[in-house]
Interface confidence: low
Amino acid sequence: HTAAQDNCTCPTNKMTVCSPDGPGGRCQCRALGSGMAVDCSTLTSKCLLLKARMSAPKNARTLVRPSEHALVDNDGLYDPDCDPEGRFKARQCNQTSVCWCVNSVGVRRTDKGDLSLRCDELVRTHHILIDLRHRPTAGAFNHSDLDAELRRLFRERYRLHPKFVAAVHYEQPTIQIELRQNTSQKAAGDVDIGDAAYYFERDIKGESLFQGRGGLDLRVRGEPLQVERTLIYYLDEIPPKFSMKRLTA
């Protein structure tokens, strides 16, 4: 006798294939691209999502850095190597044997090299700054209302523990959300700030990763919050290692 599930889908990741072959006939979902089993009660890791998304168009961008060690994702999409837990492998290489080191959110943190390049460890991104500019509104949003709404969003939509939302800054029209999560603070089962930031980024772009859920409808006291630009800065526990040539470019 089986107990095959009637409606087998992954609420937290639409980029999956699901079938009732999990324990006890429960729905088991595998990420497209990697075929890895994912836990549909929480966010899927960014590495597995990027791997699944590889058919999407390249989306490169260049940002102004808020501090000398902050990283931005200038390289756009690539087909990443993920470890058995779905995390980024410290060293990533492309089809032409060009390799580089990445941090825990998959952003390059060294110059590109060849197959001899060594990346000793996956360096954790412990501080993420999400910089948003909203469309003009009749007046500025109330800062405390905006703060509360964004904290609620990260808690309820992305299941990120409130303690990891360090601050919400607002100077119309710029909103900055600071996420902080040291290795020592992240308990088993805690959503990773990198994964939450990636889901948020895709939501803001109208590319929600959630299955069947409506797109993100952000409102502050009933007033729609429409984002027209998003920049995300990543700070690692160990500063990145780029040559002077890149730093002065």
Epitope: A3, D6, T9, D21, P23, G24, R26, D39, R159, G189
Partner: antibody
């Protein structure tokens, strides 16, 4: 604190139906499977089925297909089980139990709803 | 369905003694993902069951370390070191690798 509060005892007549409830609190209701388990007087436990509140997905023990129907109301974080065409064999205590998706075990149980089928 | 056979049916012990309960399954409980979904529950008189051990040997939160689980494949054991009065009740093993099934229960009582 995780709590599952079940509805009170149900004396019912043979052939009738009964719908019992299980109100969840202290956690995100939609993130966990809810299981239902039957315990006949002085006997072991029998798994009836589960429902995943996030999308309403259900799975049933073959023995209880057609006997039990599982539903949820997400707005009130409540799971329901309806039993139909009741006979004396259905007299038992019925438990709802939350299942953790990491270890597939029932980590929190309701206090049980006693159903007595008698004419 | 997978049949879970518990022995003994009744286990009289003296307080402070060690107790051991066996649970055998009619087929292997190793899932294709490598996990073994074998769990132990305790049902005290007049109460609902409570989770003690999950996935063979992991104590659930708040469960004292005098409880330990072991085994693999089809043979599993629950051990209780230094039995206390609050440990009395019926112990059930259960598997969720296949469609959920429970053992018949073992009643731990005072000798």
């Amino acid at each position: 604190e995780v709590q599952l509060q079940q509805s009170g005892p149900e004396p019912v007549k043979p052939g009738a139906s009964v719908k019992m409830s299980c109100k969840a609190s202290g956690y995100t209701f939609t993130d966990y499977y809810m299981n239902w388990v039957k315990q006949s007087h002085g006997k072991s436990l029998e798994w009836i089925g589960y429902i995943y509140p996030n999308n309403g997905a259900t799975g049933y023990n073959q023995k209880f297909k057609g006997k039990a129907t599982l539903t949820v109301d997400k707005s009130s974080s409540t799971a329901y089980m309806e039993l139909r065409s009741l006979t004396s064999e259905d007299s038992a205590v019925y438990y709802c139990a939350r299942e953790d998706s990491y270890y597939y075990a029932m980590d929190y149980w309701g206090q049980g709803t006693s159903v007595t089928v008698s004419s | 369905d997978v049949v879970m056979t518990q022995t003994p049916l009744s286990l009289p012990v003296s307080l402070g003694d060690q107790a051991s309960i066996s649970c055998k399954s009619s087929q292997s409980l190793v899932h294709s993902n490598g996990n073994t979904f074998l769990h132990w529950y305790l049902q005290k008189p007049g109460q609902s069951p409570k989770l003690l051990i999950y996935k063979v040997s992991n104590r659930f939160s708040g469960v004292p370390d005098r409880f330990s689980g072991s085994g693999s494949g089809t043979d599993f054991t629950l051990k209780i070191n230094r039995v206390e009065a609050e440990d009395l009740g019926v112990y059930f093993c259960s598997q969720s690798t296949h469609v959920y099934t429970f053992g018949g229960g073992t009643k731990l009582e005072i000798k």
